[in-house]
Interface confidence: medium
């Protein structure tokens, strides 16, 4: 079936930076994050707070994978783990674990990747668009449904 | 049938309960983009309280509206334009 115009919140392929305090190297890994569209609405009623809760795209089930960072000094554990989204959901943003906000302007990939992860046999997916603006549907790579 | 994974656009909809014949009350509803991903180390360093996940979101909100009084004498915002913008009520 044709690719949806506004795909629902789901796991998408992404290229992320993996680094660690004390290690000189930043490497790029292929993983999945959660992205897509969630339904919201605005109240018409006056003088009432809070408004209807607004759900946003969040992790649901996550697997953690580990990777070894090269070049870490002695005494620094070179193993670092990163999240792989297995499933996603439209839900309230959990403040306890999540920085909840609007579009950010930080890059998700290494500024100067000195090593490219080659542990994945598949071709690396397109990296995330610059998060200085939220991508529209045409920007959003999706996993096969 | 449309793809079941598609999400309807953020648009004006007529509220069936507050509308009267000839006097529709319009309300913004629909879908907006958001994403969640592991917080990059560089961002974590700037956080007072470190969070493992970063969420970037937009929500369907009124871009413009008129305040009107409907039957029963209560006030509502009759939305006139919608867009995907800042979420205010998305945290738990």
């Amino acid at each position: 079936s044709k690719e949806p115009l506004r795909p629902r919140c789901r796991p998408i392929n992404a290229t992320l930076a993996v680094e660690k305090e004390g290690c000189p190297v930043c490497i790029t890994v292929n993983t999945t994050i959660c992205a897509g569209y969630c339904p919201t609405m605005t109240r018409v009623l006056q003088g009432v707070l809070p408004a209807l809760p607004q759900v946003v795209c969040n992790y649901r089930d996550v697997r953690f994978e580990s990777i070894r960072l090269p070049g870490c000094p002695r005494g620094v554990n070179p193993v670092v783990s990163y999240a792989v989204a297995l499933s996603c959901q439209c839900a309230l943003c959990r403040r306890s674990t999540t920085d909840c906000g609007g579009p950010k302007d930080h890059p998700l990939t290494c500024d100067d990747p000195r090593f490219q992860d080659s542990s994945s046999s598949k071709a690396p997916p397109p990296s995330l668009p610059s998060p200085s603006r939220l991508p529209g549907p045409s920007d959003t790579p999706i996993l096969p449904q | 049938a449309p793809d079941v994974q598609d999400c309807p656009e953020c648009t004006l909809q007529e509220n069936p309960f507050f509308s009267q014949p000839g006097a529709p009350i319009l309300q913004c509803m629909g879908c907006c983009f958001s994403r969640a991903y592991p917080t990059p180390l560089r961002s974590k360093k700037t956080m007072l309280v470190q969070k493992n996940v970063t969420s970037e979101s937009t929500c369907c909100v009124a871009k413009s509206y008129n305040r009107v009084t409907v039957m029963g004498g209560f006030k509502v915002e009759n939305h006139t334009a919608c867009h995907c913008s800042t979420c205010y009520y998305h945290k738990s």
Epitope: T40, L45, V48, L49, L52 | P8, Q13, N15, G72, F74
Partner: antibody, heavy 118, light 111 residues
Framework: EVQLQQSGPELVKPGASVKISCKAS????????MHWVKQSHGRSLEWIGY????????GYNQRFNSKATLTVDNSSSTAFMEVRSLTSEDSAVYYC???????????WGQGTSVTVSS | DIVLTQSPASLAVSLGQRATVSCRAS??????????MNWFQQKPGQPPKLLIY???IQGSGVPARFSGSGSGTDFSLNIHPMEEDDTAMYFC?????????FGGGTKLEIK
């Protein structure tokens, strides 16, 4: 956790009235429309009407205009429905339901059974 | 009032198989890109539970095996794979116009 707790079953005589309550908890009562739905003999569902607790306006299905009256007591976060001039046709389970996103009825009370019998 | 006609009235499906319930509206329930069609599940002695809204959006906590599709006047609810716990009555509901109306219900059982 959102909960709607309805009053117990009622056995009433034809011609009498009955007032059913629906106590809300786990959310701000005045922020959401409350709907009432009738279910006869375990099958068909009929919308009776709604009330907006914050300022009290109501809307009714024309079929129930002179049959049901919806009210609220915001101090106790309770919605009420009075059904009058009862006949055997009014024997049913009555539900209250909160209105959520996209006008859905997202949380329901457990239902109140009303039996009209002489 | 908008009349909703559900079919079939009853349906028996084997565990693990697909169950499809249909709902036809007497007029379109679409408005500006949104189909105001909802689906509810009701088990004996319990209130209805919201499964799907806006034709295809899953309600909170609803398992992924429930999906909805359709637009205009023709809608369907799919359950796949069918589980023991899915034995229930299923109702469609339109909320485009007042009064909101419900379909007559489909009784789903295990074959």
């Amino acid at each position: 956790e959102v909960q709607l707790q309805q009053s117990g079953p009622e056995l009433v005589k034809p011609g009498a009235s009955v007032k059913i309550s629906c106590k809300a908890s786990g959310y701000t009562f005045t922020d959401y429309n409350m709907h009432w739905v009738k279910q006869s003999h375990g099958r068909s569902l009929e919308w009776i009407g709604y009330i907006y607790p914050y300022s009290g306006p109501t809307g009714y299905n024309q079929r129930f205009n002179s049959k049901a009256t919806l009210t609220v007591d915001n101090s106790s976060s309770t919605a009420f429905m009075e059904v009058r001039s009862l006949t055997s046709e009014d024997s049913a389970v009555y539900y209250c339901a909160r209105e959520g996103i996209f006008y859905t009825m997202d949380y329901w009370g457990q239902g109140t059974s009303v039996t009209v019998s002489s | 009032d908008i009349v909703l006609t559900q079919s079939p009235a009853s349906l028996a499906v084997s565990l693990g198989q697909r169950a499809t319930v249909s709902c036809r509206a007497s007029e379109s329930v679409d408005n500006n890109g949104i189909s105001f069609m909802n689906w509810f599940q009701q088990k004996p002695g319990q209130p209805p539970k919201l499964l799907i809204y806006a034709a295809s959006i899953q309600g909170s906590g609803v398992p992924a095996r429930f999906s909805g599709s359709g637009s205009g006047t023709d809608f369907s609810l799919n359950i796949h794979p069918m589980e023991e716990d899915d034995t229930a009555m299923y109702f469609c509901q339109q909320i485009k116009e007042v009064p909101p109306t419900f379909g007559g219900g489909t009784k789903l059982e295990i074959k």
